[in-house]
Interface confidence: low
């Protein structure tokens, strides 16, 4: 589709190699050497078969919603640089990425940037911070299970220790203690009661479960598993899941412009 009458301004895509830990954001910058009047900028990932899968796009001063809301494109104030970010990168986001620009008619042309490689590394265990970060994707080694079991064991040991200390300090108080509310004072949902909210982390990759192909649910374009993690006293963040047919939320864009299609 290249035509000789309109020289193409090159694209850059940087950094050429990017390494982030899982759960962190990974950001590439796609830069146009100059700004054509009318263009579409696409962000692609190379599939194992060397095909380009379109992740998201920028066209005519609007961001085209990606098929996965984790992939975001943002135009920078200078007009020629675009941040292409993966929010909360997963291990399986590792791969080759590039951006591609399409001049719109009458002189339709396509140009691709050089490839860049993203490596998403397994998160190293760190002391917990104030705000919980998205949980790392559970690896085939059942890393999460190991951590969970360890946490439970430590918790049980601490409880036993606490019980022992209480028994030693208050020997009478521990005898015949009732853990339920008294009849004349029912449990109240007042300021003292700590409400339990759910914090939805969205889609997690449960690798140890073999997914069997089955017909998708009528309104969900993809069968995904949702993980809801419970925290005390945190505001709820409901998982929003718009189906393609409801025409709300992220819509599936046409893949016809990947690469070099549409009409836009």
């Amino acid at each position: 589709l290249d035509s000789p009458d309109r020289p193409w301004s090159p694209l850059t895509f940087s950094p050429a190699q990017l390494t982030v830990q899982e759960g962190e954001n990974a950001t590439f910058t796609c830069s146009l050497a100059d700004i054509p009047d009318s263009f579409v900028l696409n962000w692609y990932r190379l599939s194992p078969r060397n095909q380009t899968d379109k992740l998201a796009a920028f066209q005519e001063d609007r961001i085209e919603p990606g098929r996965d809301r984790r992939f975001r494109v943002m135009r920078l104030p200078n007009g020629r640089d675009f941040h292409m970010s993966i929010v909360a990168a997963r291990l399986n986001d590792s791969g080759i990425y590039l951006c591609g620009a399409i001049y719109l008619p009458p002189n339709t042309q396509i140009n691709e940037s050089p490839r860049a490689e993203l490596s998403v590394t397994e998160r190293t265990l760190e002391p917990p911070t104030q705000s919980p970060s998205p949980p790392p994707r559970l690896s085939g080694q059942l890393q999460g299970l190991v951590i969970g079991v360890t946490s439970v064991l430590v918790g049980v040991l601490l409880l036993l220790l606490l019980t022992w200390v209480l028994a030693a300090v208050f020997p009478r108080a521990t005898r015949g203690a009732c853990v339920c509310g008294s009849e004349d004072e029912p449990l109240k949902e007042g300021p003292d009661a700590a409400p339990v909210f759910t914090l939805d982390y969205g889609e997690l990759d449960f690798q140890w479960r073999e997914k069997t192909p089955e017909p998708p649910a009528p309104c969900a374009p993809e069968q995904t598993e949702y993980a809801t993690i419970v925290f005390p006293g945190r505001p709820a963040s409901p998982g929003r899941r718009a189906s393609a047919s409801s025409l709300q939320g992220a819509q599936p864009p046409s893949p016809e412009d990947g690469p070099g299609l549409w009409p836009l």
């Epitope: 095909q51 374009p221 393609a244 864009p253 046409s254 836009l264």
Partner: antibody
């Protein structure tokens, strides 16, 4: 009510040209791409090309690139397809159809079709 | 070009019976949760009618006897209980890349 009303089908001699029209109503004209699909007698569906009414941008099947011209008249909510250098094998019913420009949900409305016969 | 192969080429079904049509693409038309494959029915002398879009989503006004499934290269259109009105030619179509192509069609007749 969404409608795509077609006209322009005719009996044309080989080597001639034809201009088919597709008048759209009942929706915002510039919010949907318009495509042309043809169907030879007793055969399947074949995509010809598409036009973006908001800016006149077009794309084509390689087979029709050199002979087909797609255009729109926004004031009349009308899309046109001109097909040149007609041959007997261009005899077919020609359909215009639309697709939402914001997302790809397939071709949700079709014109009634117009028959083009190429014969000497 | 992506080639869509439909099977069977024709199908004869009794009213009330289920029916299913397969469409196989020469390369994957799916990514990140969306499959760019659509199903149409065409009755004699009429334009095609969209039944299912994006592989599994029922177009408004289409009876829920129709359902679509599949991803990657293999897709299926199912009619849970065929009615006399379902006779016609069924086509799959992809919109993954240019050129857009259709399957060759499956003719469904009612016994």
């Amino acid at each position: 009510e969404v409608q795509l009303v077609q006209s322009g089908g005719d009996l044309v001699k080989p080597g001639g040209s034809v201009r088919l029209s597709c008048v759209a109503s009942g929706y915002t004209f510039t919010s949907y791409y318009l495509y042309w699909v043809r169907q030879a007698p007793g055969k399947g569906l074949q995509w010809i090309g598409g036009v973006n009414p908001s800016n006149g941008g077009t794309n084509f099947s390689e087979k029709f690139k050199s002979r087909a011209t797609l255009s729109v008249d926004k004031a009349k909510n009308t899309a046109y397809m001109q097909l040149n250098s007609l041959r007997a094998e261009d005899t077919a019913v020609y359909y215009c159809t639309r697709r939402d420009s914001n997302y790809d949900g397939g071709f949700d409305y079709w014109g009634q079709g117009t028959l083009l016969t190429v014969s000497s | 070009d992506i080639v869509l192969t439909q099977t069977p080429p024709s199908l004869s079904v009794s009213p009330g019976e289920p029916a299913s049509i397969s469409c196989r693409a020469s390369k994957s038309v799916s990514t990140s949760g969306f499959s760019y494959l659509h199903w149409y029915r065409q009755k004699p002398g009429q334009p095609p009618q969209l039944l299912i879009f994006l592989a599994s989503n029922l177009e408004s006004g289409v009876p829920d006897r129709f359902s679509g499934s599949g991803s990657g290269t293999d897709f299926t259109l199912r009619i849970s209980r065929v009615e006399a009105d379902d006779a016609g030619v069924y086509y799959c179509q992809h919109s993954w890349e240019l050129p857009l192509t259709f399957g060759q069609g499956t003719k469904v007749e009612i016994k």
